[in-house]
Interface confidence: low
């Protein structure tokens, strides 16, 4: 950005700057995100038994020791790996839900389907879910002011660098069938540089995952399409066919049609296409 | 691990003072939410104020704002400051630690607060 | 600022029995409520949290239900060590607040 540029001119370090200096274009932490981060494990943990030997307080320090005091656009994955450690967790085959573009549904889904599980239903993607933090080199403190902007900023950000780590570990610990949410609506239904096309697609594991289906989810109910057949799904069946992995995709016509079948299959409506 | 309560005693009605709770077996740089909580001779417990240690953020009951101030005063000590004393604010005040999630499991034994004139 | 209604504020049971104690927010809280136990001269014992979840060393005669804005504390096998006062606490955490509300207590006499 700009300022970066007036920076490198004068050759001034982040760190060395007046803190009023340090402005970043993005939000700030947000706010009580220490006691969120830590309330949140303690309830998660509370309500999965598997989860109930992880010790919370440990859990923070190792968050915080990821990007507390370091200097905010140079965040690496090996930061986050003794976070990774304490929240090891697996996913019983056929069972993992990959989304893009489409959270809420993709939420949604699990909440009703309680067998399956996106990277927000494990307990890292459930601490940081919907959450911004950051740090300050040579600081302890917590910087609640403003936080690196992917684009405007830096991509090595604490927070990019922390999805971007748990969602390779999410994806490499996948097995079986594994499945994604895409959003028809969107111009770029699948999207190379989204998260699941990025980091996600490339570390499912062949030797473990047999077949990857991709669910389209439509936006109008109109929409009689069969997005299937679209540019962007090709290109993904490609990348996907290449690593060895067999490639299926489903059209879902009508998303709320299909939550509510998912919560009651034997409704006799739920036996014609959705 | 333990928390203990001092700083009660007598006070004049309209006098001010100050509650400390320290920490002992562990410390308040880690992340907890710290609270006062206050209980009249023969009577319930009533909430008063907490703090986040993390953030410093800090919530109080509405009928404490203004006359109390919850701080963390140091990696071991949080403080309750109280303002315009009156009889009713007699009583035993109890520091409570919470590690996140509203259970509160370790609180100090209590120190007694009475003002009279 | 929520309320916590609790009743009875006394009950009397014989060693051996079983108490129920009730417990009503003015709002819904979800599942997160404790209940503590408080004997004379001393500070409240985390007995239940999460609603139903028993502390760490709490007895299994103790057990916590319910949701929303209704919940009860049952004690089966009165013990004479039971005889103390009941606390329910709200404690509706979110990342901008910690309001939390006590009940006005249940005392237990035991028999």
């Known amino acids: 950005s700009g300022l970066n540029d007036i920076f490198e001119a004068q050759k001034i370090e982040w760190h060395e700057l007046p803190r009023w200096r340090q402005q970043w274009s993005g939000s700030g932490t947000t706010s009580r995100f220490p006691e969120t981060v830590l309330a949140r494990c303690v309830k998660y943990t509370e309500v999965h038994p598997e989860m109930r030997h992880v010790d919370c307080q440990s859990v923070w320090d190792a968050f915080k020791g990821a990007f507390i005091s370091k200097y905010p656009c140079n965040i690496t994955e090996e930061d986050y790996q003794p976070l990774v450690k304490l929240g090891t967790q697996t996913v019983p085959c056929n069972k993992t839900l990959l989304w893009s573009r489409i959270k809420d549904l993709a939420h949604q889904f699990t909440q009703v389907q309680r067998d399956m599980f996106t990277l927000e239903d494990m307990l890292l993607g459930y601490l940081a879910d919907d959450l911004t933090w950051c740090g300050e080199f040579n600081t302890f403190e917590i910087n609640y002011q403003s936080c690196p902007d992917w684009r405007k900023d830096c991509s090595n950000n604490p927070v990019s660098v922390f999805w971007k780590t748990v969602s390779r570990r999410f994806a490499e610990t996948a097995c079986g069938v594994v499945h994604v949410m895409l959003n028809g609506s969107r111009s770029k239904i699948f999207d190379k540089n989204s998260t699941f096309g990025s980091v996600e697609v490339h570390n499912l594991q062949p030797e473990k995952v047999q077949a990857l289906e991709a669910w389209v989810i439509h936006g109008g109910r109109e929409d009689s399409r069969d997005l299937c057949q679209d540019p962007t799904i090709k290109e993904l069946e490609s990348i996907i066919s290449k690593r060895n992995i067999r490639f299926f995709c489903k059209n879902i016509y009508r998303p709320d049609k299909f939550l509510q079948c998912v919560k009651n299959p034997e409704d006799s409506s739920c036996l014609s296409g959705i | 691990q333990e928390l203990v309560e001092s700083g009660g005693g007598l006070f004049q009605p309209g006098g001010s003072l100050a509650l400390t709770c320290k920490a002992s077996g562990f410390s308040l740089s880690n992340i907890y939410v710290m609270c006062w909580v206050r209980q009249a001779p023969g009577k319930g417990l009533e909430w008063i104020a907490c703090i986040g240690t993390g953030s410093g953020d800090t919530d109080y009951a509405t009928w404490a704002k203004g006359r109390f101030t919850i701080s963390k005063t140091s990696s071991t000590t949080v403080t309750l400051q109280m303002t315009s004393l009156t009889a009713a604010d007699t009583a035993t005040y109890f520091c409570?630690?919470?590690?996140?999630?509203?259970?509160?499991?370790?609180w100090g034994p209590g120190t007694l607060v009475t003002v009279s004139s | 600022d929520i309320v916590m209604t609790q009743t009875p504020s006394s009950v009397e049971a014989a060693v051996g029995g079983t108490v129920t104690i009730k417990c009503q927010a003015s709002?819904?809280?979800?599942?997160?409520l404790a209940w503590y136990q408080q004997k004379p001269g001393q500070p409240p014992k985390l007995l239940i949290y999460s609603a139903s979840t028993l502390a760490s060393g709490v007895s299994s005669r103790f057990k916590g239900s319910g949701s929303g804005t209704q919940f009860t504390l049952t004690i089966s096998d009165l013990d004479s060590a039971d005889a103390a006062t009941y606390y329910c606490q709200s404690y509706y955490y979110t990342s901008t607040s910690y309001p939390n509300a006590f009940g006005g207590g249940t005392e237990v006499v035991v028999k």
């Open positions: 409570a630690r919470d590690p996140g999630a509203g259970t509160w499991n370790l």
């Open positions: 709002q819904t809280i979800g599942s997160r």
